[in-house]
Interface confidence: low
């Protein structure tokens, strides 16, 4: 056959679906690889073809669209399972072609099992809620397109294994779950089960996400440098190791890039000749506030090094701060026989 633009196996789109539930999977060509959509392609006379490779097999085979009750079907650029079976796991390929053009991409589909408490190998999306912030909602994800707007599904929400009813501050409101005031105790996995009828059959969609309660932007402050500070002096003798910690607290801020760095005489350590190493450690509070510590180390400090300016800098979306460390050379204790004797005029 003629050459086909093969985008390979798109492992970035590892699709996971639950066993015995409907799944609708869009051909990734139109989402991520081609500059035109399915309608344009279709009206230009291009045909979308689906095939698959079973798990642990090398053989590409056509998808059987003649199963009882149309268990697998295609609609425009969507491959439908009504419902999935465990052995549907494999690599699926969608190919767009006519006599002069061909483009294809493969993607892995994994059908996973869940237990009665919705535990499974499914990778869960994380939804962050601000602590004590007011009413916030999470929405049952990835259910669009499964049923028409005329169908009114029933939605049941669970926290872990427990159905959410009469919870103190969590209220199910159809597709939404409202948190009146999010607290650390609201951390956990939340599942919505959407039940809807279709052609005399009842289908269930199970969607689980992880809720993580994080620091509120109302409480967010610019970075706070705990160390160095005005009270600590780093006093060293030449030849000793100089270690200075830069410890910075960052309020949680959604999508903020937190940065800490040292300058020595106004330059980054990489841009100067002295042998400096920087080690960084990061810790997080329960609400994802961050504390970063960068320890500046000079193994054998010289008297020149002890005259330099060491400044810790920090930056977040809330602002930038800097603090200089107080570094000085230790005045050596006098040795009586030489220094004091000389001081008394002895020879």
């Amino acid at each position: 056959s003629e050459r086909c633009d093969d985008w390979g196996l798109d492992t970035m789109r590892q699709i996971q679906v639950f066993e015995d539930e409907p799944a609708r999977i869009k051909c990734p060509l139109f989402e991520h690889f081609l500059k035109f959509n399915y309608s344009t392609a279709h009206s230009a006379g291009l045909t979308l073809i689906w095939y698959w490779t079973r798990q642990d097999r090398d053989l590409e085979e056509p998808i059987n669209f003649r199963l009882p009750e149309n268990r697998i079907s295609k609609e425009k650029d969507v491959l439908w399972f009504r419902p999935t079976l465990l052995n549907d796991t494999g690599n699926y390929t969608c190919m767009l072609r006519n006599t002069t053009y061909c483009s294809k991409v493969a993607f892995p589909l994994e059908v996973v099992q869940k237990d009665s408490c919705f535990n499974s190998p499914m990778k869960l999306p994380v939804h962050k809620l601000y602590i004590e912030y007011g009413i916030q909602r999470i929405t049952c994800p990835n259910v669009d397109g499964y049923f028409p707007s005329s169908v009114k599904p029933t939605i049941t929400w669970y926290m872990g294994c427990y159905k959410i009813q009469n919870f103190n501050n969590v209220i199910p409101e159809g597709m939404n779950l409202s948190f009146l005031i999010a607290l650390i105790s609201n951390n956990g996995n939340y599942t919505c089960v959407v039940t809807y009828p279709e052609n005399g059959r009842t289908f269930h969609l199970t969607r689980t996400l992880t809720v993580k309660v994080v620091g509120s932007p109302k409480n967010a402050v610019p970075p706070v440098i705990h160390s160095p500070n005005d009270h600590v002096v780093y006093e060293k003798e030449p030849g000793e190791e100089l270690l200075i910690p830069c410890t910075v607290y960052f309020s949680f801020l959604m999508d903020s890039r937190n940065e800490v760095w040292w300058t020595i005489d106004g330059k980054k350590p990489d841009d100067i000749t002295i042998d400096v190493t920087i080690n960084e450690s990061i810790s997080h509070s329960r609400t994802e506030d961050e504390t970063r510590t960068q320890i500046l180390s000079i193994k054998k400090v010289t008297s020149e090094d002890l005259k330099r300016s060491y400044v810790c800098h920090a930056r977040s979306a809330k602002g930038e701060v800097a603090k200089a460390a107080k570094v000085k050379q230790k005045v050596p204790a006098p040795r009586y026989t030489v220094e004091l004797a000389c001081g008394f005029g002895a020879t």
Epitope: I131, Y133, G134, I135, N168, I181, I184, S185
Partner: antibody
């Protein structure tokens, strides 16, 4: 200096509506919640609800859900409470009070308005 | 709703003497994050209420240290080590752990 200046006393007939205002100054209006509290003659205090001026989110005591409506005008740093279908039971002093950054003002209300006296009488 | 019960309803005191007010809640005020949102306020005659204490024992700025708040769970106490004339008025405890916020009936501190 933080100040909450409330509108003056009101005399209304039963069945009418009234809108009480609370003008904030001396702080960032959108950084704090505004709470409303009712004090009936010589009695205790009742929390009516609050509003987050930044997002406009409101929270009501169920008892006042159909009675009170809380709004804000960010441009003038003013919070409002409208009371409808007035009866003699609504005669009271109404206070606005600044809540801290917690949505329900959990840690107490650190600044209070001077109060607005509402009398409902035919 | 959480019921806040204050005792006594009236407390007659002598200037310079100590005073103690009790406040009990119908449910624990310890929230799941480990905070207890129990607050005290004072309403002097003809004035608006004023925050005295929040989070059980934290004094509001400008509140003299003769006031102390203590307690946990459902039982709380406000103590004044030596009553002064400016302390007279009605003291309210109130809770902010459970929705809706609720106040005690108040304790009137008056001169004997």
């Amino acid at each position: 200096e933080v100040q909450l200046q409330q509108s003056g006393p009101e005399l209304e007939k039963p069945g009418a509506s009234v809108k009480i205002s609370c003008k904030a100054s001396g702080y960032s209006f959108t950084g704090y919640n505004m709470n409303w509290v009712k004090q009936s003659n010589g009695k205790s205090l009742e929390w009516i609800g609050n509003i987050d001026p930044y997002f406009g989110g409101t929270s009501y005591n169920q008892k006042f859900k159909d009675k009170a409506t809380l709004t804000v005008d960010k441009s003038s740093s003013t919070a409002y409470m409208q009371l409808k279908s007035l009866t003699s039971e609504d005669s009271a002093v109404y206070y606005c009070a600044r809540g801290d950054v917690h949505y329900y003002g959990y840690e107490g209300f650190d600044y209070w308005g001077q109060g607005t006296t509402l009398t409902v009488s035919s | 709703d959480i019921v806040m019960t204050q005792t006594p309803l009236t407390l007659s005191v002598t200037i310079g003497q100590p005073a103690s007010i009790s406040c009990k809640s119908s449910q624990s005020l310890l929230d799941s994050a480990g905070k207890t949102y129990l607050n005290w306020l004072l309403q002097r005659p003809g004035q608006s209420p004023k925050r005295l204490i929040y989070l059980v024992s934290k004094l509001d700025s400008g509140v003299p240290d003769r006031f102390t708040g203590s307690g946990s769970g459902t039982d709380f106490t406000l103590k004044i080590s030596r009553v002064e004339a400016e302390d007279l008025g009605v003291y309210y405890c109130w809770q902010g752990t459970h929705f809706p916020l609720t106040f005690g009936a108040g304790t009137k501190l008056e001169l004997k």
